[in-house]
């Protein structure tokens, strides 16, 4: 117990979640694919989340979907459409702490 | 305080034209879209045009595809519906409204809207 | 394009009812829904964003909630000033679509 004890206060004291760059603005055209990236580092290793105008990202197979990447996480929408407009926000949490970055695709 | 007021609404014959202004104060115009929004008597709400003024991002309904203008002047604080071709079932009360900081389509501030009549 | 289908269309209520409305998305639009309240000769106000959000200084009898497609505004204990016509609104596909209206009449 009093080791389990030492390596918890060790990752407390080393834990943090750092968002690296902020997101870009996209604009592109109809039916092109459109990439926007998350860069987030953290530890423990961040969860992060992908919303779209204040809604969880809905996931279209072969057409929309995200992914981790070694920088945090990456949204890729392909055949774009106007309906896809819109404020895109990732959240990433390491279970402590809570960052996010914003970035509008037009 | 957020604000917006509309004008320029009146009687107008058919194949008519009008220019809508949308005059916002409270808030930094250039960081948020403006849709303009209609509502024909007796009717729901109607969604017309909208504009990111920051970005240049213009987006119509089919309605008033190629007969409608949306623009902006940042300078001015005032989003403008250019309408022309005008017809008779354009006759509504046009409003103007704000986006939210983190949604594109969620409208949390409204003018008091201006009313539009199409007829000879 | 995305259909909103709310309904009903019209109700009667009496003071203190609690009332229920429901819109149902044609497709998924997560958790993206607005409501707005309009009152005769004034513009719409914003009431519930996100499904379930309730906007600064909206009355807590008023909620809304989310199963699949289909969306819900609550008022749980109707008020004189409540009476009045609501639309739901999708707000995860651009440009948002509306329902077409329920209005809360006296009864």
């Known amino acids: 117990p009093t080791s389990s004890w030492n390596i918890s206060s060790e990752l407390n004291k080393d834990s943090y979640l750092t968002l690296d760059e902020p997101m870009n603005n996209i604009t592109t055209s109809l039916g092109q694919t459109a990439e926007l990236h998350c860069k987030v580092s953290g530890n423990p290793p961040p969860t992060i989340r992908w919303f779209k105008n204040d809604a969880p990202v809905v996931q279209e197979p072969r057409r929309l979907s995200f992914r981790s990447t070694i920088y945090g996480s990456r949204l890729r929408i392909r055949n774009l459409d106007t309906t896809d407009t819109g404020y895109f926000q990732c959240v990433a949490t390491n279970g402590k702490e809570v960052v996010s970055s914003t970035g509008v695709l037009f | 305080e957020v604000q917006l007021v509309e004008s320029g609404g009146g009687l107008v014959q058919p194949g008519g034209s009008l220019r809508l202004s949308c005059a916002a104060s409270g808030f930094t115009f250039s960081s948020y879209g403006i849709h303009w929004v209609r509502q024909a008597p007796g009717k729901g709400l109607e969604w017309v045009a909208y504009?990111?003024?920051?970005?240049?991002?213009?987006i119509y309904a089919d309605s008033v595809k190629g007969r409608f203008t949306i623009s902006a002047d940042t300078s001015k604080n005032t989003a403008y519906l250019q309408m022309n071709s005008l017809r008779a079932e354009d006759t509504a009360v046009y409003y103007c409204?704000?986006?939210?900081?983190?949604?594109?389509?969620?409208?949390?501030?409204w003018g008091q809207g201006t009313l539009v009549t199409v007829s000879s | 394009d995305i259909q909103m289908t709310q309904s009903p269309s019209s109700l009667s209520a009496s003071v203190g009812d609690r009332v229920t409305i429901t819109c149902r998305a044609s497709?998924?639009?997560?958790?993206?829904v607005a409501w707005y309240q309009q009152k005769p000769g004034k513009a719409p106000k914003l009431l519930i964003y996100s499904a379930s959000s309730l906007y600064s200084g909206v009355p807590s009898r008023f909620s809304g909630s989310r199963s699949g497609t289909d969306f819900t505004l609550t008022i749980s204990s109707l008020q004189p000033e409540d009476f009045a016509t609501y639309y739901c609104?999708?707000?995860?596909?651009?440009?948002?679509?509306f329902g077409q209206g329920t209005k809360v009449e006296i009864k």
């Open positions: 504009i990111h003024s920051g970005i240049g991002y213009t």
């Open positions: 497709q998924s639009v997560s958790s993206a």
């Open positions: 609104q999708q707000t995860y596909w651009s440009p948002g679509t």
């Open positions: 409204a704000r986006t939210s900081s983190t949604s594109t389509s969620v409208m949390d501030y």
